[in-house]
C-alpha cells in the first residue's frame, strides 16, 4: 500500500480537515502500528494457566508465561491492543514446567505505545468545528519475562 | 502533545507535499508508534554479558536477558527501531545468575511493526518530483523470553 | 426503544458504487459505534468493518478495504457505508449494527437490513 | 483469520428438549464470543455475550459456556419460538468473524 506524496499542503502536522472530511483518520489507520499480539495466539487452554508447555506459541512455552488481554477503543488508534497478562507470580521451573520457583519473579516488561484520540479543538464550536488529534502515551504490557529478584541496596 | 486539525485538505491520505517541504515524515513521527526501548538502557557493561544480574534494567535481570540494538534508516519512519538481541543461547541459572541451564532456550519475541519507506513515486522524475510512503510489516524482537524447548512430535 | 433504520433495497450495475445508510435513535449516538455486516443469499454472515461514531475512527475487513468508506453524521445521528466498484459477489443484505466503543463488542442491536443487488 | 466452526449444522428436536450447540475457535479467544439467533428474512439478534453473559430480554433458558477455543450454546428446554439459526462469532482479534451457523427445527 502507497501514500501518495502530492503537493498543496504545506504543514502536515497540523493539515487535516475538520470531522466531515474524515481522511485523517483514514491516514492514521495506516500510519498506526500493527497491534496484533506478536506471537499466534494460544491453540490449547493450558495457555490460560501457570504452566510452561512444551509446545504451542513463546507465550505459553514461556517459564513466564501470559496471555493477551484485548483492550479496545473505537474511538483511539489504534483500535486494538494487546496486554500481557502474566499468568504466574514466580517462574515455572524448567525441570517440571508446573512447578514455580521462588528465586524467580514472572513480570510483565512495559513499553510506551503512541496512541491518538479524537477530541473537540479549544473553543470550537457549532456543527462545523474542528477536531484535535490528541498524541498520548498509553502503556502496555509485551511480554511476561523471568528475573532474578531485584536487591535492595 | 496536540495535532491540530484544519481545513483545506481534502484528501489525506495522499495530500502530502514534494520532498523539499519535509513536513509528512514529520507527521508521521507523531503518529507511528513509540518505539525507544521499553526498558531503560543498561548503563552497566555486564548487561551485555551473560548473566542475569540482581539489579538495573529488566532486560539485564532477565534470566534470557537482553541488549538494545539500534536499527536506523533515514528513508524509514520510523528511523530508529530497537531490536532486543538475546545474549545467552541458553537460560541463566536462577540459583547463580551465571551458569546456562540446557534445559532452557532464550528466544525473541518477534513483532510485526508497521512502518513507512519514502519512495520516488511510480513515474515522477525531476527535482520536484513527489515521493511516495511505502507501509511496510517489519520484524521486530522486542525482548527475549526463557522457554521450555519445543517438543516435536 | 433503540432502533436502526436502513435505506432501502438497491439494484447496480458492476463497477457502480453503492451508500446504504442507517439512521440510529432513542440512544446516545457518539456513545456507541456501528459496525457493518452483509450476508449473501444462502451464505454465512461476513463482517465489513465498523466506525467509532464519536472520533470517525474505522476499521475495515481486508477484503473490502480498498473499496469501502463508513462515515457518520451526528448532526442526523446516520451512519453510511458506501461501497465502490461492486461486483456481482457483492449482492448480499448489508447490516448496520451498534456496537459498544469498548472491549466487550457485541452488537446489540441491528438494522433491518438493505439489500444490494449488483447485475448486469 | 479466525475460523469458527459450529457442530452441528444444523438438528431437529422436540418441544421441552435440552438443546446444545457448541462452536469451536482455531485459537484461543479468551472470552470473546457471542451468540446471535436468526430467522428467516429477519437481522440476527443477539442472545449471549462474552461467553456466557444473557442479553437484557432474552429468555432464562439460554445460557452459553466455555473460554479460550470451545463454547456452547444450551437451551435448557426448546420452545416453538426457538427455531431458526444460531450464529457464533468471536470479537478478540479483527477480523471479527461468525460461525457458519446451525440451523434448529423443531420437530
Known amino acids: 500500500v502507497s501514500l501518495r506524496i502530492q503537493e498543496g499542503c504545506s504543514h502536515l502536522p497540523s493539515c487535516c480537515p475538520s470531522k466531515e472530511q474524515e481522511p485523517p483518520e483514514e491516514w492514521l489507520k495506516w500510519s498506526s502500528a500493527s497491534v496484533s499480539p506478536p506471537e499466534p495466539l494460544s491453540h490449547t487452554h493450558h495457555a490460560e494457566s501457570c504452566r510452561a508447555s512444551k509446545d504451542g506459541p513463546l507465550n505459553s512455552r514461556a517459564i513466564s508465561p501470559w496471555s493477551y488481554e484485548l483492550d479496545r477503543d473505537l474511538n483511539r488508534v489504534p483500535q486494538d491492543l494487546y496486554h500481557a497478562r502474566c499468568l504466574c507470580p514466580h517462574c515455572v521451573s524448567l525441570q517440571t514446567g508446573s512447578h514455580m520457583d521462588p528465586l524467580g519473579n514472572s513480570v510483565p516488561l512495559y513499553h510506551n505505545q503512541t496512541v491518538f484520540y479524537r477530541r473537540p479543538c479549544h473553543g470550537e464550536e457549532g456543527t462545523h468545528r474542528r477536531y484535535c488529534l490528541e498524541r498520548r502515551l498509553y502503556r502496555v504490557s509485551l511480554a511476561c519475562v523471568c528475573v532474578r529478584p531485584r536487591v535492595m541496596a | 502533545v496536540s495535532l491540530r486539525i484544519q481545513e483545506g485538505c481534502s484528501h489525506l491520505p495522499s495530500c502530502c507535499p514534494s520532498k523539499e517541504q519535509e513536513p509528512p515524515e514529520e507527521w508521521l513521527k507523531w503518529s507511528s508508534a513509540s518505539v525507544s526501548p521499553p526498558e531503560p538502557l543498561s548503563h552497566t557493561h555486564h548487561a551485555e554479558s551473560c548473566r542475569a544480574s540482581k539489579d538495573g534494567p529488566l532486560n539485564s535481570r532477565a534470566i534470557s536477558p537482553w541488549s538494545y540494538e539500534l536499527d536506523r534508516d533515514l528513508n524509514r519512519v520510523p528511523q530508529d527501531l530497537y531490536h532486543a538481541r538475546c545474549l545467552c543461547p541458553h537460560c541463566v541459572s536462577l540459583q547463580t545468575g551465571s551458569h546456562m541451564d540446557p534445559l532452557g532456550n532464550s528466544v525473541p519475541l518477534y513483532h510485526n511493526q508497521t512502518v513507512f519507506y519514502r519512495r520516488p513515486c511510480h513515474g515522477e522524475e525531476g527535482t520536484h518530483r513527489r515521493y511516495c510512503l511505502e507501509r511496510r510489516l517489519y520484524r521486530v524482537s522486542l525482548a527475549c523470553v526463557c522457554v521450555r524447548p519445543r517438543v516435536m512430535a | 426503544q433503540v432502533q436502526l433504520v436502513q435505506s432501502g433495497a438497491e439494484v447496480k450495475k458492476p463497477g457502480a458504487s453503492v451508500k446504504v445508510s442507517c439512521k440510529a435513535s432513542?440512544?446516545?449516538?457518539?456513545?456507541?459505534?456501528i459496525s457493518w455486516v452483509r450476508q449473501a443469499p444462502g451464505q454465512g454472515l461476513e463482517w465489513l468493518g465498523w466506525i467509532g461514531a464519536y472520533s470517525g475512527f474505522t476499521k475495515y475487513a481486508q477484503k473490502v478495504q480498498d473499496r469501502i468508506t463508513m462515515t457518520t453524521d451526528a448532526s442526523t445521528t446516520t451512519a453510511y457505508m458506501e461501497l465502490r466498484n461492486l461486483r456481482s459477489d457483492d449482492t448480499a443484505v448489508y447490516y448496520c449494527?451498534?456496537?459498544?466503543?469498548?472491549?466487550?463488542?457485541?452488537?446489540?442491536?441491528w438494522g433491518q437490513g438493505t439489500l444490494v443487488t449488483v447485475s448486469s | 483469520d479466525i475460523q469458527m466452526t459450529q457442530s452441528p449444522s444444523s438438528l431437529s428436536a422436540s418441544v421441552g428438549d435440552r438443546v446444545t450447540i457448541t462452536c469451536r475457535a482455531s485459537q484461543n479467544i479468551n472470552s470473546h464470543l457471542n451468540w446471535y439467533q436468526q430467522k428467516p428474512g429477519k437481522a440476527p439478534k443477539l442472545l449471549i455475550y462474552t461467553a456466557s453473559s444473557l442479553q437484557s430480554g432474552v429468555p432464562l433458558r439460554f445460557s452459553g459456556s466455555g473460554s479460550g477455543t470451545d463454547f456452547t450454546l444450551t437451551i435448557s428446554s426448546l420452545q416453538p419460538e426457538d427455531f431458526g439459526i444460531y450464529i457464533c462469532?468471536?470479537?478478540?482479534?479483527?477480523?471479527?468473524?461468525f460461525g457458519g451457523g446451525t440451523k434448529v427445527e423443531i420437530k
Open positions: 432513542e440512544y446516545t449516538f457518539s456513545n456507541y459505534g
Open positions: 462469532q468471536q470479537t478478540y482479534i479483527t477480523p471479527l468473524t
Open positions: 449494527a451498534r456496537v459498544g466503543t469498548g472491549t466487550d463488542s457485541y452488537f446489540d442491536f
